[in-house]
Interface confidence: low
């Protein structure tokens, strides 16, 4: 267990021409707040998909009123960190969405109005316990500067927060076979419950006796480093063998430098030497133009005539990412059977199996659901020799073969329009109503039925208020 921490440093106009208008005015003062959403692995970044690692909401920032005639400055920010607690192992690779929300404080009917000002998203690799990573992201004409880190909550330690530390039972030494717990040298590692020999640094287990590998490591005990840094160039496969093994471990294993940066070890960590057009701790920040040919794998570059304006890569089939540097997620082939969750770790596919299934592709049935097929993503639920299908949203029937229209029950109140959606349904509310099902009137006395949480944050249903 641990906490992901996000510190917003600044939010304001990006460099270059076309500065955005201030989101606030003398007539309509406003304040900002932020939402962060985290997902494990190389998840889809669709805003509607669940924040499986967690989400957090910042406090409101100070009220800001634009000075007439002045350009939009960096806007005043909320105090404090955004903290997202996570219970299980830190996945090492994660996707994030950071949203900047504007709360307008004018005299509009129904109280404060919220609108999404900017949304940035990305995928990053991060070890727990490491230093703050710096980042700059642009969304249209806005620029967001922030830092982030993942830290373990005692008694967990390690790069994935999977090793446990306990106070020493004796003042002088740890028990047989147990090491001191760096950096908590006065504590000792708790006895491992994973498979014997499972790497405490690069493996973890969710059940006794297993050994699951973090990204960049492989083998039955997660002791074999997998590096693509010397095997794949950022513009596609080089002449070197793909997926090759290199000696390790070391801070440059797995190549922490993005965008073709070269990694060199330093006494305490590593240093990235970035190619032209990239900068940042891991070469993750781009100041590149189309003239630099930033789109890999045959991507088409549009815009970006000067370093201060953004470019967009239109990727050919089979590639994705802001620079077309990533192959399409092989999980789209649905290799995990029996409803297993697929993670494309780059060097390998990993399946996280549902309860009752095991095996590299979740092909082994451990329960009395053997031979029971639930269609359309449904899962078989066992119990005392009997079993039934728990169907995915949008499907029903004994074997989940019947398509269910989530809008058939007319769930949107007060004249709201219902739209079927991959995660359920979405209600577009009639004027004067809000809520997941348009069930809340917007009151003329300035109070709304959801007084403080911005739309879409809680509870779980997708909502569209704006």
């Amino acid at each position: 267990a641990g906490v992901f921490e996000l510190q917003i440093h600044s939010f304001g106009p990006g460099p270059g021409p076309g500065a955005p208008r201030s989101p606030c005015s003398a007539r309509l003062p406003c304040r900002l707040f932020f939402r962060v959403c985290l997902k494990p692995g190389l998840s889809e970044e669709a805003a509607e998909s669940p924040c499986a690692l967690g989400a957090a909401l910042s406090a409101r920032g100070p009220v800001y009123t634009e000075q007439p005639g002045a350009p939009a400055p960096d806007l005043p920010l909320p105090d404090g960190l955004l903290q997202v607690p996570f219970r299980d192992a830190w996945p090492g690779t994660f996707s994030f969405i950071i949203e900047t929300w504007r709360e307008e404080l004018g005299d509009q009917i129904g109280g404060p109005a919220w609108s999404l000002l900017a949304r940035v998203a990305g995928r990053r690799r991060l070890a727990a316990g490491g230093p703050w990573a710096r980042d700059i992201q642009r969304a249209g004409a806005w620029e967001l500067r922030f830092s982030y880190r993942a830290r373990c909550e005692p008694p967990a330690v390690g790069t994935a927060c999977t090793r446990l530390c306990r106070p020493r039972s004796a003042p002088s030494r740890c028990g047989p076979g147990l090491r001191p717990c760096a950096p908590l040298e006065d504590e000792c590692e708790a006895p491992l419950v994973c498979r014997a020999g499972c790497s405490p640094e690069h493996g973890f287990c969710e059940q006794p006796g297993e050994c699951r590998c973090l990204e960049g490591w492989t083998g039955p005990l997660c002791t074999v480093p997998v590096s693509t840094s010397s095997c794949l160039s950022p513009r596609g496969p080089s002449s070197a063998t793909t997926g090759c093994l290199v000696p390790g471990p070391g801070p440059c294993d797995g190549n922490p430098c993005a965008n073709g940066g070269s990694c060199s070890e330093t006494p305490r960590s590593f240093e990235c030497t970035c190619p032209r057009g990239f900068y940042g701790l891991r070469c993750e920040v781009s100041g590149v133009t189309c003239a630099d040919g930033p789109c890999f794998n045959g991507g088409l570059c549009v815009g970006g005539a000067d370093p201060d304006s953004a470019y967009i890569c239109h990727c050919p089939p089979g590639f994705q990412g802001s620079n077309c540097e990533k192959r399409v997620d092989r999980c789209s082939l649905q290799p995990c059977r029996n409803g297993g969750l697929c993670l494309d770790l780059g060097h390998a596919l990993r399946c996280r199996c549902r309860a009752g299934f095991a095996g590299p592709r979740c092909e082994h049935d451990l329960d009395d659901c053997a031979g029971r097929a639930c269609a359309n993503g449904g899962t078989c639920v066992e119990g005392g020799g009997a079993h039934r299908c728990s169907c995915a949203l949008g499907f029903g029937g004994r074997d989940c073969r019947e398509r269910a229209d989530p809008c058939a029950a007319r769930p949107c109140a007060h004249g709201g329009r219902c739209y079927a959606h991959f995660s359920g349904l979405v209600c577009a509310c009639a004027p004067g109503y809000m809520g997941a099902r348009c069930e809340f009137p917007v009151h003329p006395d300035g109070a709304s039925a959801l007084p403080a949480a911005p739309p879409g944050l809680r509870p779980g249903d997708p909502q569209r208020y704006l």
Epitope: V3, F33, P50, C51, A52, G54, A55, A56, L57, S58, A59, R60, P78, G80, L82, Q83, V84, P85, E153, V381, S390, L393, P406, A409, P411, G424, G435, A436, R437, E439, F440, A449, L450, P451, A452, A453, L457, R458, P459, G460, D461
Partner: antibody, heavy 122, light 107 residues
Framework: QVQLVQSGAEVKKPGASVKVSCKAS????????ITWVRQAPGQGLEWMGD?????????NYNEKFKSRVTMTRDTSTSTVYMELSSLRSEDTAVYYC??????????????WGQGTLVTVSS | EIVLTQSPATLSLSPGERATLSCRAS??????LHWYQQKPGQAPRLLIK???QSISGIPARFSGSGSGTDFTLTISSLEPEDFAVYYC?????????FGGGTKLEIK
């Protein structure tokens, strides 16, 4: 370990206000929503609202109590407060605070306080 | 608001028997349903979250199933300490609501 410790029982007259406290320990206080649930004698559970301690202005109230309930927090003492005003006899109940888990976009309540009995009687 | 209806209101069984408790929602709540156990004089205790996800420290004899509007809590083999009141809760839409409860008593 995670603990939520609530203030002691209260006896109030109709029309008065009561402020119940809930002191949290054993976890990062500002990271988890705290919810308030009440239970009248012999009755079921009723959700009153919740507060995000990382931002004291981030609250959600049950419409039924909205005009009478105020939830606040003091990060220096890791304490959340629930104040209910204009008390009436039907507000006699045990008031619980609970910490909400953070999984996906909706929340269950995994740790509960011991409860505070509030009796409203003239 | 979403109404959760629990049945039966009272269930009389003996230790060792299998208990099946039902919770029906007035509209679809996806998988945002949780189960709690409450004993006299105590705070509720979370048993199952999100229909079927187990909770650390809760015995494996407790399991949940269902989807959409119909949900079930199953106790595979009753122990003496399992006799209590059980509540379901939805966190799919405001306001969050609980079912009326099912009292599980010794026959």
């Amino acid at each position: 370990q995670v603990q939520l410790v609530q203030s002691g029982a209260e006896v109030k007259k109709p029309g008065a206000s009561v402020k119940v406290s809930c002191k949290a320990s054993g976890y990062t206080f500002i990271s988890y929503w705290i919810t308030w649930v009440r239970q009248a004698p012999g009755q079921g559970l009723e959700w009153m609202g919740d507060i995000y301690p990382g931002s004291g202005s981030t609250t959600n109230y049950n419409e039924k109590f909205k005009s009478r309930v105020t939830m606040t927090r003091d990060t220096s003492t890791s304490t959340v407060y629930m104040e209910l005003s204009s008390l009436r006899s039907e507000d006699t109940a045990v008031y619980y605070c609970a910490r909400e888990t953070t999984v996906g976009g909706a929340y269950a309540m995994d740790y509960w306080g011991q409860g505070t009995l509030v009796t409203v009687s003239s | 608001e979403i109404v959760l209806t629990q049945s039966p209101a009272t269930l009389s069984l003996s230790p060792g028997e299998r208990a099946t408790l039902s919770c029906r929602a007035s509209q679809s709540i996806n998988n945002n349903l949780h189960w709690y156990q409450q004993k006299p004089g105590q705070a509720p205790r979370l048993l199952i979250k999100y229909v079927s996800q187990s909770i650390s420290g809760i015995p494996a004899r407790f399991s949940g199933s269902g989807s959409g509007t119909d949900f079930t809590l199953t106790i595979s083999s009753l122990e003496p300490e399992d006799f209590a009141v059980y509540y379901c809760q939805q966190t799919n839409a405001w306001p969050l609501t609980f079912g009326g409860g099912t009292k599980l008593e010794i026959k």
